[in-house]
């Protein structure tokens, strides 16, 4: 499908010469016809915002250790998770660690594993979280 | 038929400029992407950028960023490139092709000669 | 922006087919469909044989087949012909408006 797009600025993003581009709306990127769009492809690419981009970006797929939370649409990339039992640290690029099986002595689990953090557990004798 | 007619060979001395045409003829200037490939002698051929001809919006590859500029008189349906501060390496010859579906070039002029030497 | 590689040179004798392999990166070959290859003869401009990985525009032989798998895509010529014999470049588009050529494969028909 093509859509006709619209003339916006879009300040100075390093492949255009000039800052007034033609930007395509989310979900579609530049058709080899100026002035004119294409969708992206369901579940295989995307584009999040509006864009001069002569293809949708490839979506991602999850890695093995990783399961998907919400699949690729036109306008949002894949979104994986650790799988049950793993948990990768927000914003960390490192692959998914085991869940700790329960808390050192002295100390008393407050929250479960996710795929988000480790269990968080406190001392049984203060109130502060402690993460391990 | 769709054709791109390039202009004549070029000689120019180092660190001089030189200005490219590339005419289309056959269809509607405006239509598609112009894109702008090089080769040099005995080389491979080397992507050098690209260009809107409706709104004159141009990409480059990073290495010739800040060193060419592409332009377009639609009044006579042909887009220019222009090459600053030229070496003994930008010797090559410059090719012009259209944007065809499926992000590729097709069809192409039949290309210009730059010689740069002093 | 380093170029695909192809290898230098292939050779086959009339009515052979002869398979270029053309390897990039996840970020170009491996990343979009977006996969042309080039005829190009001694003092020619380059020729479109292949897009989109496999498909041929019209025109162009069925003998000239094009096919992708991972970070590598390749062009089969089948049935070898004299006139097949030029130098062939392969393409990606690599993201972000920009395209990146093969170094060339020259092909002999032996």
């Known amino acids: 499908a093509t859509i006709k797009l619209h003339d916006q600025s879009i300040g100075t993003q390093q492949w255009e010469h000039s800052p007034l581009g033609e930007l395509c709306p989310p979900g579609s990127h530049r058709s080899e016809h100026p002035g004119a769009c294409n969708r992206c492809t369901e579940g295989v690419g995307y584009t999040n915002a509006s864009n001069n981009l002569f293809a949708c970006l490839p979506c991602t797929a999850c890695k093995s250790d990783e399961e998907e939370r919400s699949p690729c649409t036109t306008t949002r990339n894949t979104a994986c998770q650790c799988k049950p039992g793993t948990f990768r640290n927000d914003n960390s690029a490192e692959m998914c660690r085991k869940c700790s099986r329960g808390c050192p002595r002295g100390m008393v689990k407050v929250k479960d594993c996710t795929p988000w953090s480790d269990i968080e557990c406190v001392h049984k004798e203060s109130g502060n979280g402690h993460n391990i | 038929e769709v054709q791109l007619v390039q202009s004549g060979a070029e000689v120019k001395m180092p660190g001089a400029s030189v200005k490219l045409s590339c005419r289309v003829s056959?269809?509607?200037?405006?239509?598609?992407?112009i894109h702008w490939v090089r080769q040099a002698p005995g080389q491979g051929l080397e992507w050098m950028g690209w260009?809107?001809?409706?709104?004159?919006?141009?990409g480059s590859a990073e290495k010739f960023r800040g060193r060419v500029a592409m332009t377009r008189d639609t009044s006579i349906s042909t887009a220019y490139m222009e090459l600053n501060r030229l070496t003994f390496d930008d010797t090559a010859v410059y090719y012009c092709a259209r944007q065809h579906r499926g992000n590729t070039f097709d069809p192409w002029g039949q290309g210009t000669l730059v010689t740069v030497s002093s | 922006q380093s170029a695909l590689t192809q290898p230098a040179s292939v050779s086959g004798s009339p009515g052979q087919s002869i398979t270029i392999s053309c390897t990039g990166t996840?970020?170009?070959?491996?990343?979009?469909?977006?996969v042309s290859w080039y005829q190009q003869h001694p003092g020619k401009a380059p020729k479109l044989v292949i897009y989109e990985v496999s498909n041929r525009p019209s025109g162009v032989s069925s003998r000239f087949s094009g096919s992708k798998s991972g970070q590598t895509a390749s062009l089969t010529i089948s049935g070898l012909q004299a006139d097949d014999e030029a130098d062939y470049y392969c393409n990606s588009y690599q993201g972000y408006n920009t395209w990146v050529f093969g170094g060339g494969t020259k092909v002999t028909v032996l």
């Open positions: 056959g269809d509607t200037f405006t239509a598609y992407f």
């Open positions: 260009f809107n001809p409706i709104s004159g919006t141009a």
């Open positions: 996840s970020s170009d070959i491996g990343a979009y469909k977006y």
